[in-house]
Interface confidence: medium
Amino acid sequence: KTLCSMEEAINERIQEVAGSLIFRAISSIGLECQSVTSRGDLATCPRGFAVTGCTCGSACGSWDVRAETTCHCQCAGMDWTGARCCRVQP
Amino acid sequence: KTLCSMEEAINERIQEVAGSLIFRAISSIGLECQSVTSRGDLATCPRGFAVTGCTCGSACGSWDVRAETTCHCQCAGMDWTGARCCRVQP
Amino acid sequence: KTLCSMEEAINERIQEVAGSLIFRAISSIGLECQSVTSRGDLATCPRGFAVTGCTCGSACGSWDVRAETTCHCQCAGMDWTGARCCRVQP
């Protein structure tokens, strides 16, 4: 083979092998979620997880997220707060 | 080296180099989230973000998502609406 | 070219080609979300999706997630339950 056609062949092979490795790796990425429930008006996600939603006791649907990790239920006298926590899982 | 064993060596090298690049790239992927709050009964996520949950004023827990980007709080006379917005961050 | 400099050239080419393939693949990863609404107090996400948040009828903001796939609204006499369901989309 000439160097030129060899270069083409190597390029093709890289595309093939790397492509299939990438496809397998990307396909295995998932979204891993868990719930954390705490007494009172605050619930904090584990390190490395992001808050995607919050739930509150007493039917309360008003909440905010503090420091990107903690659910805060805004209704008075909250008995419990829950955080829905997710992360990308390779 | 024969062309055949050279091909094998190249394949192995592709697996190694591509594998390490892929591992690095996949390992750095994270979930980035932010909150958007608006007056009224609608709150829209920035471009590129997906709605993962909504929150509403007046303790309201009833909402729906419009056009995959906007939180809509369903209770009457909503003073504010919040959207929890997330995206995969390379 | 010597085998040594050829090896270096191949390594460089793998880095280049695989690197750009990986960048494109990673850049195209997104968060795909959808809503599922059901009558009653339970709503289940499709296979492969994770629950990121829940919504309930009657303004109820109290919910929990069962088996990581199902939203359960906790207020009495729920007329409907909604699940916000997301997955990483290559």
């Epitope: 584990p46 390190r47 490395g48 990107e68 | 750095s28 994270g30 980035e32 961050q89 | -």
Partner: antibody, heavy 116, light 107 residues
Framework: EVQLLESGGGLVQPGGSLRLSCAAS????????MSWVRQAPGKGLEWVSS????????NYADSVKGRFTISRDNSKNTLYLQMNSLRAEDTAVYYC?????????WGQGTLVTVSS | DIQMTQSPSSLSASVGDRVTITCRAS??????LNWYQQKPGKAPKLLIY???YLQSGVPSRFSGSGSGTDFTLTISSLQPEDFATYYC?????????FGQGTKVEIK
């Protein structure tokens, strides 16, 4: 060539404050998470804090949570660590490191001594 | 937090020796295991990431293996510049945690 240069270390009394800086060059700073790792004299390595590329997400070791604040200025290619309520056990060499998973590049370190 | 346990804590070896250091995680961390070399007064240097991937510029006498909870760093033929302290670190779960270190000394 990737370079990370820490500054701001020194001697401080217990309860005092210090602000460490890390000037980065040789890579696209705004595209990478960054971390602080410390090493007490004669001891092993301890992760302290990390911050995402955009600065929206931060993580802290339990031993420093509520006392230390990590931040970054992507326009200046600089990472910061604000350390308040310092204790004797915070005495260490503080390294800034690129990434928040495998730390592929490290600065030379800056010594923080907490003593009365 | 995940505990990382290295063994041995120190070892004596000669130039040319094959050296093996092990690291055990308190729970499975898949392949999220990194190895660093540190010389006195210097910053650590990444040798291996992802359990087995050689960091750019690191000599091929260094290799890593393992997955799950048990990992190994091998130096196939010890060189004078390899006498240092070696740390493993897991990056599978926050917070990142390091092993206590293994000091490789001249026999």
């Amino acid at each position: 060539e990737v370079q990370l240069l820490e500054s701001g270390g020194g001697l401080v009394q217990p309860g005092g404050s210090l602000r460490l800086s890390c000037a980065a060059s040789g890579f696209t700073f705004s595209s990478y998470a960054m971390s602080w790792v410390r090493q007490a004299p004669g001891k092993g390595l301890e992760w302290v804090s990390s911050i995402s590329a955009s600065g929206t997400s931060t993580n802290y070791a339990d031993s420093v949570k509520g006392r230390f604040t990590i931040s970054r200025d992507n326009s200046k290619n600089t990472l910061y660590l604000q350390m308040n309520s310092l204790r004797a056990e915070d005495t260490a060499v503080y390294y800034c490191a690129k990434s928040n998973s495998d730390f592929d590049y490290w600065g030379q370190g800056t010594l923080v001594t907490v003593s009365s | 937090d995940i505990q990382m346990t290295q063994s041995p804590s120190s070892l004596s070896a000669s130039v040319g020796d094959r050296v093996t250091i092990t690291c055990r995680a308190s729970q499975s961390i898949s392949s999220y295991l990194n190895w660093y070399q540190q010389k006195p007064g210097k910053a650590p240097k990444l040798l291996i990431y992802g359990a087995s991937y050689l960091q750019s510029g690191v000599p091929s006498r260094f290799s890593g293996s393992g997955s799950g909870t048990d990992f190994t760093l091998t130096i196939s033929s010890l060189q004078p510049e390899d006498f240092a302290t070696y740390y493993c670190q897991q990056s599978g779960y926050d917070p990142a945690t390091f092993g206590q270190g293994t000091k490789v000394e001249i026999k």
